[in-house]
Interface confidence: low
């Protein structure tokens, strides 16, 4: 999917208001210096491409992120603010009901979510510093 035509400001607002807090909750108890950021992105469409990949594509050692609250909200934001991203716009409340309780958080998953936090920070990078 080409994220060029997304409403970046609306996605940014969704991240700041809720997704960021869910990521922090997931990472609670983990030192911020524990993982090095090895994934980066160079513009907003590129960031969303990397965020989608890390959030929804299963990887070795971490297959379960798509069921997490931050993932559900990410999917909802992309469905709503990226034209054609999803045929059916996901309702966040329905997504919450479907969510399975996470039993085990592997170190690999923590590392992956740490990378996601970095990607989201890059996505929200200011054009110009606020005075």
């Amino acid at each position: 999917y080409d994220f060029t035509n997304c409403d970046f400001e609306k996605i940014k607002a969704a991240y700041l208001s809720t997704i960021s807090k869910d990521l922090i909750t997931y990472m609670s108890g983990t030192k911020s210096t524990e993982f090095n950021n090895t994934v980066s992105c160079s513009n907003r469409p590129h960031c969303l491409t990397e965020i989608q990949s890390l959030t929804f594509n299963p990887t070795a050692g971490c297959a379960s992120l798509a069921k997490e609250m931050f993932a559900m909200k990410t999917k909802a934001a992309l469905a709503i603010w990226c034209p054609g991203y999803s045929e059916t716009q996901i309702n966040a409340t329905q997504a919450m009901k479907k969510r399975r309780k996470r039993k085990v958080t592997t170190n690999k998953c923590l590392e992956q979510v740490s990378q996601l936090q970095g990607l989201w920070r890059r996505f929200n990078r200011p054009l110009l510093k606020q005075q």
């Epitope: 992105c41 513009n43 590129h46 054009l127």
Partner: antibody, heavy 122, light 108 residues
Framework: QMQLVESGGGVVQPGRSLRLSCAAS????????MHWVRQAPGKGLEWVAV????????HYADSVKGRFTITRDNSKNTLNLQMNSLRAEDTAVYYC???????????????WGQGTMVTVSS | SYVLTQPPSVSVAPGETATITCGGN??????VHWYQQKPGQAPVLVIY???DRPDRIPERFSGSNSGNTATLTISRVEAGDEADYYC???????????FGGGTKLTVL
């Protein structure tokens, strides 16, 4: 390994044209803004031009506007600088430079080529 | 267009702290980047976004930016730090990248 390699420099007479190329490898070229920066012998750095990651916009230093054209081919991972109506003051080392390119802004230059020398002389 | 002003030269003894300034009108509102260039070599990014350090750049290099002046600080200066240093900003008003004139750091 990430690399930028410039080519096309040389000696050219005033008023003539020259085309510089830059081959990129080892990174996702199509996601980066690309710039040309030049440095006259014994002088400081001078920004020349930028092209957005998707080629949708270009901007030029006042000193080259209307004479130089920056283009890119994302399918071939190449950046070009077409230089027309060359002047003696265009004599410099020309660097091809990568910059993470943000939603309508440009960032720090995190990867530089080694440069190619352009000499404009009669 | 936007102008960045740097001192032409700064001298410092080994082990001391070097401070290189970059002046610009309300530069504190811009994100400032710094480059090191040694003779015959391409420039290298040493500080980006005012104060962030790329990988492989020693912690001795730091940056700050407020008001009308951005500053590059090199603590415990070594002979290998001798080089030209350039500050840089992106001018959003003109869509131009702007470099300072450069500062030659001499290690005595």
């Amino acid at each position: 390994q990430m690399q930028l390699v410039e080519s096309g420099g040389g000696v050219v007479q005033p008023g003539r044209s020259l085309r510089l190329s830059c081959a990129a490898s080892g990174f996702a070229f199509r996601t980066y803004g690309m710039h040309w920066v030049r440095q006259a012998p014994g002088k400081g750095l001078e920004w020349v031009a930028v092209i957005w990651y998707d080629g949708s916009a270009t901007h030029y230093a006042d000193s080259v506007k209307g004479r130089f054209t920056i283009t890119r081919d994302n399918s071939k991972n190449t950046l070009n600088l077409q230089m027309n109506s060359l002047r003696a003051e265009d004599t410099a080392v020309y660097y091809c430079v990568r910059a993470p390119q943000w939603y309508l802004s440009a960032e720090a230059f995190d990867l530089w080529g080694q440069g190619t020398m352009v000499t404009v002389s009669s | 267009s936007y102008v960045l002003t740097q001192p032409p030269s700064v001298s410092v003894a080994p082990g001391e702290t070097a401070t290189i300034t970059c002046g610009g009108n309300l530069i504190g509102a811009y994100l400032v980047h710094w480059y090191q260039q040694k003779p015959g070599q391409a420039p290298v990014l040493v500080i980006y976004d005012d104060s962030d350090r790329p990988d492989r750049i020693p912690e001795r290099f730091s940056g700050s930016n407020s008001g009308n002046t951005a500053t590059l600080t090199i603590s415990r200066v070594e002979a290998g730090d001798e080089a030209d240093y350039y500050c840089q900003v992106w001018d959003h008003n003109t869509n131009h990248m702007v470099f300072g004139g450069g500062t030659k750091l001499t290690v005595l």
